[in-house]
């Protein structure tokens, strides 16, 4: 049924949308969006589009391979990232705490949701569909999907705000450790993500349906209240607005402010005194920006296919099959790219950050050890950390640089 992290209905029906997670509002068995499990009032099915079965069949196996790869890479990558940040005192700081939060959200999705999804894809049915555990999984699966993407989105926003704050608050002195404000941010992010995912847990139920006289059950969004009906109607736009546009707008705003701040401070002795400091913060900003760009690239195709499905596609149009083939293909590409986002951040950090690269290498070759050379010759932000220097300016600069130890 949702490799993608905001999929909803995870079953399919006998018509055009055999695996397209779109809205087809009066069909037998369903896919992505809420669908009533009855046929149209005239009692007949549309004739299906021939292309859809080819795309669906190919996708089933391609997606299984991709999902298994994402599961392994995501589990190893995110677990390693968490271990690096937990084990290395020098890595425990504001931005890295947010990155750890991001990794934990991805790890939860990868470990719990991906196996359910692969089972659904291969077996063609919901796991434990005839007992209470199946009902529990039906509510847990979309809840964790939404929570995970919410955690990703809000952490990216927090990282963007954090970068701006780091540049705006030049005088801030910070040693090793996670600042209280960051800890509060992380707790708030998780709470808010869980709250925003509650409608999924409420709305998703095991709905029985019949096919050729046989009784089946599928996990799907089934609106039973006015609020859930409203949620169902605005869902695609809400997902696009909050879970996609919002982090991009947030990054754009705070990065613009950060650039202005840096340009305003270009002249004077402070610039000279903080040149290394600026350099390393610029590097951290680049890393965060890189994570946001990757997020945007991973999620854009899926959101675009959703919006096109909502605005352009007409299920009653006799010439809909060509558009459907395009949307199906786009949806499947989007699903895989969106799922890939949950394993790509550790890879991105490995390539963008020297510090993380070294830690990854040593951690994956047994454990991430904190050697002297790592602390001095391979600086966290392009500068070595020299605790012995008692010059006041340097002292402040260096201590504050611990907040930015990513690169």
């Amino acid at each position: 049924d949702n490799p993608e992290r905001y999929s909803t209905n995870l079953s399919n029906h006998v018509d055009d949308f055999t695996t397209f997670r779109g809205t087809e509002l009066s069909f037998l068995v369903t896919t992505h969006q809420p669908t009533n499990l009855v046929l149209p009032s005239n009692g007949s099915m549309h004739n299906y589009c021939p292309q859809q079965t080819k795309i669906t069949s190919a996708f089933k196996y391609i997606n299984t391979v991709i999902s298994c790869t994402i599961f392994i890479v995501g589990m190893v990558g995110n677990a390693t990232l968490l271990r690096i940040i937990y084990q290395n005192k020098c890595m425990r700081n504001g931005p890295n705490a947010l990155i750890a939060s991001l990794a934990l959200g991805d790890l939860i999705y990868v470990v719990i949701d991906l196996p359910i999804n692969v089972f659904k894809l291969l077996a063609g049915r919901w796991p434990f569909d005839h007992n209470d555990f199946g009902v529990f999984l039906c509510k847990l699966f979309p809840f964790l999907q939404k929570s995970s993407v919410g955690i990703t989105v809000l952490n990216l926003c927090a990282l963007s705000v954090d970068r701006y704050r780091a540049v705006a608050s030049w005088s801030r002195v910070q040693g090793i450790g996670i600042p209280l404000v960051t800890a509060i941010e992380i707790v708030s992010i998780w709470i808010l993500s869980f709250i925003l995912a509650i409608p999924e847990a409420i709305g998703f139920v095991m709905v029985p349906f019949e096919y050729r006289g046989e009784q089946h059950k599928t996990c799907m969004l089934n609106a039973t209240s006015k609020f859930m009906e409203f949620y169902q109607d605005v869902k695609d736009w809400w997902l696009f607005g909050f879970y996609f546009c919002m982090p991009l707008v947030c990054t754009a705003i705070f990065y613009t402010l950060m650039t202005c701040e840096m340009l305003n401070r270009r002249n004077g002795s402070l610039r000279i005194a903080l040149s290394e400091h600026l350099k390393q913060r610029r590097e951290v900003a680049k890393t965060v920006f890189c994570l946001v760009v990757i997020f945007a690239l991973c999620w854009f195709p899926l959101h675009l296919s959703r919006i096109l499905k909502k605005t352009v596609y007409n299920e009653m149009d006799k010439n809909r099959c060509e558009l459907l083939s395009f949307l199906l293909l786009m949806d499947y590409i989007g699903i895989n790219l969106a799922t890939m986002n949950s394993c790509i951040n550790p890879i991105a950090l490995y390539f963008v950050s020297k510090k993380f690269k070294n830690c990854f290498q040593s951690c994956l070759c047994c454990c991430c050890y904190q050697s002297k050379s790592l602390m001095t010759s391979v600086p966290m932000n392009g500068t070595s950390i020299q605790w012995k220097n008692h010059d006041q300016n340097n002292h402040n600069t260096d201590r504050s640089s611990h907040k930015d130890s990513m690169n």
Epitope: N12, V14, V29, V38, T53, R212
Partner: antibody, heavy 116, light 112 residues
């Protein structure tokens, strides 16, 4: 023993109407989907209608859509096929069949001839 | 519509021989429930069709184990290991995954 009894068919003029019935016994009728399948004189089989266990959902191919209506009476364990605006190409042997993931049991058939 | 192509149209066999009938669908017929609704029916002269195999390879109750169904996606086969006199008739394949459900044109199994 599962039984699907179909009474004898008949000769109908083009444009005319006819209702076929299928009385069942030996199984829980309301637990099965039901279908009507026809076989042309050329021995070609065509599914013409299906109905869900509770009768809420019915499906028809384009060739009969709007002309044929499938219905069921679970209390009487009987299946019906109402045929209107009959054409010469509707001439066939009509079979009722039980549906439970496949058409497991079939009636003996009712011959329908549409001719002027 | 999904076109079901059966080969051969006629299959002359000697009693005790193995018979193999092929059925190819114009589209993949795996249904979204995970099932492939591919069935084989046998119609003996003067009788109504009888279900032999359902969901590609499952024998219906009372069907001898000399009947074996196999295949996936678009290619399906019915094999009769040792043909007996009571096996003679027309064999039809049928797909019930995509509406309108369709039958193959039939394969007549006859004595050589």
């Amino acid at each position: 023993e599962v039984q699907l009894q179909q009474p004898g068919g008949g000769l109908v003029q083009p444009g005319g109407s006819l209702t076929l019935s299928c009385a069942t016994s030996g199984f829980t009728f309301s637990s099965y989907g039901m279908s009507w399948v026809r076989q042309t004189p050329a021995k070609r089989l065509e599914l013409v209608a299906t109905i869900s266990t509770n009768g809420a959902t019915a499906n028809y191919p384009d060739s009969v859509k709007g002309r044929f209506t499938i219905s069921r009476d679970n209390a009487k364990s009987t299946l019906y096929l109402q045929m209107r605006s009959l054409k010469s190409e509707d001439t066939a042997m009509y079979y009722c069949a039980t549906e439970k993931g496949a058409m497991g049991y079939w009636g003996q058939g009712t011959s329908v001839t549409v001719s002027s | 519509d999904v076109l079901m192509t059966q080969t051969p149209l006629s299959l002359p066999v000697s009693l005790g021989d193995q018979a193999s009938i092929s059925c190819r669908s114009s589209q993949n017929i795996v249904h979204s429930t995970g099932n492939t609704y591919l069935e084989w029916y046998l119609q003996k002269p003067g009788q109504s069709p009888k279900l032999l195999i359902y969901k590609v390879s499952n024998r219906f109750s009372g069907v001898p184990n000399r009947f074996r169904g196999s295949g996936s996606g678009t290619d399906f086969t019915l094999k009769i290991t040792r043909v007996e006199a009571e096996d003679l008739g027309i064999y039809y394949c049928f797909q019930g995954s995509h509406f309108p459900f369709t039958f193959g044109s039939g394969t007549k199994l006859e004595i050589k």
